[in-house]
Amino acid sequence: LRPSRVHNSEENTMRALTLKDILNGTFSYKTFFPNWISGQEYLHQSADNNIVLYNIETGQSYTILSNRTMKSVNASNYGLSPDRQFVYLESDYSKLWRYSYTATYYIYDLSNGEFVRGNELPRPIQYLCWSPVGSKLAYVYQNNIYLKQRPGDPPFQITFNGRENKIFNGIPDWVYEEEMLATKYALWWSPNGKFLAYAEFNDTDIPVIAYSYYGDEQYPRTINIPYPKAGAKNPVVRIFIIDTTYPAYVGPQEVPVPAMIASSDYYFSWLTWVTDERVCLQWLKRVQNVSVLSICDFREDWQTWDCPKTQEHIEESRTGWAGGFFVSTPVFSYDAISYYKIFSDKDGYKHIHYIKDTVENAIQITSGKWEAINIFRVTQDSLFYSSNEFEEYPGRRNIYRISIGSYPPSKKCVTCHLRKERCQYYTASFSDYAKYYALVCYGPGIPISTLHDGRTDQEIKILEENKELENALKNIQLPKEEIKKLEVDEITLWYKMILPPQFDRSKKYPLLIQVYGGPCSQSVRSVFAVNWISYLASKEGMVIALVDGRGTAFQGDKLLYAVYRKLGVYEVEDQITAVRKFIEMGFIDEKRIAIWGWSYGGYVSSLALASGTGLFKCGIAVAPVSSWEYYASVYTERFMGLPTKDDNLEHYKNSTVMARAEYFRNVDYLLIHGTADDNVHFQNSAQIAKALVNAQVDFQAMWYSDQNHGLSGLSTNHLYTHMTHFLKQCFSLSD
């Protein structure tokens, strides 16, 4: 017998979030991004795993690939050739780093309903893609690039020098993948598939990080990755272009590096095709405050690529590094020479500029004390972009359309008033010529994806509204969230506070600060999330706060570049300042304040705990950086310069966690790291632990064997359970 549920009040039927809810992903949401294949058609994988083609204009849909075919090769992904004759099916997915993975690929011929036999693709393949027109294939196998005119043809081998951990063709090495390109590929088809551009990375001289992978064997394996830490030898990059119709005519032709870039260490940062015979390359000095955009043209007579100095555009920062997190990429207009690009205006806000001849003569398209964030599409008459202008909330994203066909250009916010309470953070996905687009709203309400007419902006249909999630949340006591700002010494500190469901300002609550705080990051965003901190507020009665301090993004260069060459100072100060302000609000129990963070956040939380303020009772650092000398060159030097005596060695030394070992004596510290972290190496935590032991400071630690920077799978459950116990103990909350 069970007592019947009391229905006398809504409160009684509602329950708090449980840790199990979070770990099971009970309240996860879905988004819908159409896989556009034309102006009015898209592909989507249906709930029963058929690949369905939708035509918006006729309203018709049909299955182009059945779930049976997908299942026959255990396919987890697919790609339709632009001529719609073939589909590649991807299976045996094997993750490598953040973006990279290998897989087995099968080619399915839609015309005869059979898999292509003969000249099958080798396995495993590191990257594969169709040409933008027709059904040519480019793929990378064992660090070399191959080309197929058609799926059934024998391959043409473009590069021959590929070697594991030495020479990478068409795919990035570790540091370019993680810190520069943010892709698994480093090859780019020209718009009609005439040419294929690719990068070659030579890692021969890069020092190698080695760590043990314990596995199940008698002896652990050693993982070796060429990984340039700050100040170390970097990869040598070269860009080549090959004619895919006549690949053996003159072979791959190297694209020249601008002289002002080639004079010292440099990076390649991105490649953008303009036409089949015009390409735009972006380069960056190793000291990342000078970027050069170079437009190159194909010389038919010499079969070479010519990059005249008159088509070099320099972008330089005098107050920090070039760009935001990355240097922005250009979006070319229909004249195939002028382009739109986001960079800092004279007031130090990132805005859209139109460049026709020189950067000096750039026409500013957007302006104000807010930032343009992404240019989605430029058509003959419109430019679509996102910004955080609306109502002056930096943590929002709305989509705008600027008419560029008329003068003066008029601006319209496409999303600002659509679902104002529910939706304040959007991204968009456009079909060819922006005939239609999908809007994906991430919150603060339950996410929703909708389809719109590109000319009228009219909503055509809802693609995904997360009804099941909405229903599941009906009897859940979710925490309350508020986004506000603190004004401190001419600095605006935006914060998000997550409050227990029955929050009462007259009571005292334990406070947990969740911090990331890395350069050009943003934690205070108007997005929906039901996650661990939601549970801590809902069930355990904690107040959780996220604060965007100096170094964070989308609020102008003054805030962003404040941390330049001084990582580990202002980010920490601003978290501490915010905590003091929160205490002043009167509902925080100042004896029960904790801080936690992951990665850069682990670094900041460690430094905050070791700040000697006495504010924090305890804290957690997951996979923290502990010294900038241990982290990747491309990322670290962007913000810190070089660890040399004549540059910034002093601050590299001053900003370590180890240097503050003594200060951990009066806090409870939980240090957590995966032993197979390819990104922030276990070395970082090993050094913290060693310094704490040497200082005879007690602390708690947890390692996750063979886990990388993401601590995924069963480790995730263990991690959050462990951290929950730690915090509850710290806050004297009963289990």
Partner: antibody, heavy 118, light 107 residues
Framework: EVQLVESGGGLVQPGGSLRLSCAAS????????MSWVRQAPGKGLEWVSW????????GYADSVKGRFTISRDNSKNTLYLQMNSLRAEDTAVYYC???????????WGQGTLVTVSS | DIQMTQSPSSLSASVGDRVTITCRAS??????LNWYQQKPGKAPKLLIY???SLQSGVPSRFSGSGSGTDFTLTISSLQPEDFATYYC?????????FGQGTKVEIK
Amino acid sequence: EVQLVESGGGLVQPGGSLRLSCAASGFTFRGYIMSWVRQAPGKGLEWVSWISPEGSRTGYADSVKGRFTISRDNSKNTLYLQMNSLRAEDTAVYYCARLQYGTWFDYWGQGTLVTVSS
Amino acid sequence: DIQMTQSPSSLSASVGDRVTITCRASQSISSYLNWYQQKPGKAPKLLIYAASSLQSGVPSRFSGSGSGTDFTLTISSLQPEDFATYYCQQGTLLLPTFGQGTKVEIK
């Protein structure tokens, strides 16, 4: 299955003209470089000419430059070789071949004999 | 034009023999070297492309090697149907040229 069938060969007097045809099937003709290769009686192979997939670019051996013209009709899946000012040394079996990646000849026709003699 | 020189111009061998034919280019051609087999009255047939890749349907006793200027075609164990003329061909600069051929005869 890929098939290339040449036609149009025969006996022609020096200075005369001849047009060879090659009918292609079993593959997407418009996507490939096509070529003519010849073989004089008892001799080795000699490349004659190639044409790009869309037909806008061509290449010729020095021995035939200015006299021979290669062309194609992608709607008919047919390759042509217009041979003018023929000489005795042009006597050969003419093969139509698919020139994969502009590099190797992966499929060949059975050949058509052209004899230039008075 | 790039000249291709094959050696030997002819050879006699028995069934089961290992046969090697070499081809030298007058300048470097990377790996753009192909091998063909031709029987009397028939069209040539592609055996090896890109120096070492076996064309689909060609027996595995045929193999190719080399890069730059020096290349080799090897028949690991000669079969009766392998008696024919073999040609090498370079495929660079869109100006294909053939070697003069190597005739493999029954000893």
